[in-house]
Interface confidence: medium
Amino acid sequence: QAGPLPKPTVWAEPGSVISWGSPVTIWCQGTLDAQEYHLDKEGSPAPWDTQNPLEPRNKAKFSIPSMTQHYAGRYRCYYHSHPDWSEDSDPLDLVMTGAYSKPILSVLPSPLVTSGESVTLLCQSQSPMDTFLLFKEGAAHPLPRLRSQHGAQLHWAEFPMGPVTSVHGGTYRCISSRSFSHYLLSRPSDPVELTVLGSLESPSPSPTRSISAAAGPEDQSLMPTGSDPQSGLRRHWE
């Protein structure tokens, strides 16, 4: 009796955070003796889709021509190799942006402040939301996520930054969502530049790297984008 079939790997291209209407491909990679690949979507009858492997038979392609709410969710794949099947892959969370209109992000008291001043970022949504995410371009450390108490629907969230220094300078965006469907996000707000002036310094430089966030009910953090094909907004829901 042979050993267990290796667990396949699943990923999405161009990434796991897709704007409404854009195409996305889910790939499942197993072994060369795979005969069929199956993709399961959480909450849907299994298998959600089945594909024959592409040569050299170690992976399969699941195409979504146009991203909609229907496709947002958590996916796992596995493969069949006669007569058995593999363990499920780790989950892939496919998130759709553009489910709601973009919020407006503003800086209080002003986007141009002096080091030591207290600053608050205000994210305002056009329709009531209960979760607001804040991103900073190039940030490698967590930024806060605000969820309203008891799921109350709000039109805004305040992100108090306290007394700022030059490290707080940079480009920020926010996104809003509703907790009952974490896979659906608003369009990102237009960027807002926070410039922090020191007593003897010029305005702080603005990072140019793109953003990527890990977003989950308990874990909301920002990470720099790398070359990982799944870079983008990731959800860690263990």
Epitope: Q1, G3, L5, Q35, E36, H82, P83, D84, W85
Partner: nanobody, 121 residues
Amino acid sequence: EVQLVESGGGLVQPGGSLRLSCAASESIFSSNVMGWYRQAPGKQRELVAAVGIQGLTKIGDSVKGRFTISRDNAKNSVYLQMNSLRAEDTAVYYCAAGAYVRFLQQSPDYWGQGTQVTVSS
């Protein structure tokens, strides 16, 4: 020659438990995924659970958290432990064997005769 033989069905009250057994010939058991289907009167046959050669399991959504499947390689047998039974679990339960892809296609290669499970007060 009967190659899959089920046992353990019967009448049970709602909330009760039953354990179904299926004995298979060694040649079938050692080289196939084993599983259970059920068919209620007037309804389509549905996959309840399957267990692979390596012991991986798939459990149908309607019974998740209540039913478990296991296989005993020494006895060439597969078992379906059914807990928290409901009236809607009433059906004829069939043991089946085949490649997993055939289970997904609702057409395993081997079938038992079936055993009746009735959940009623």
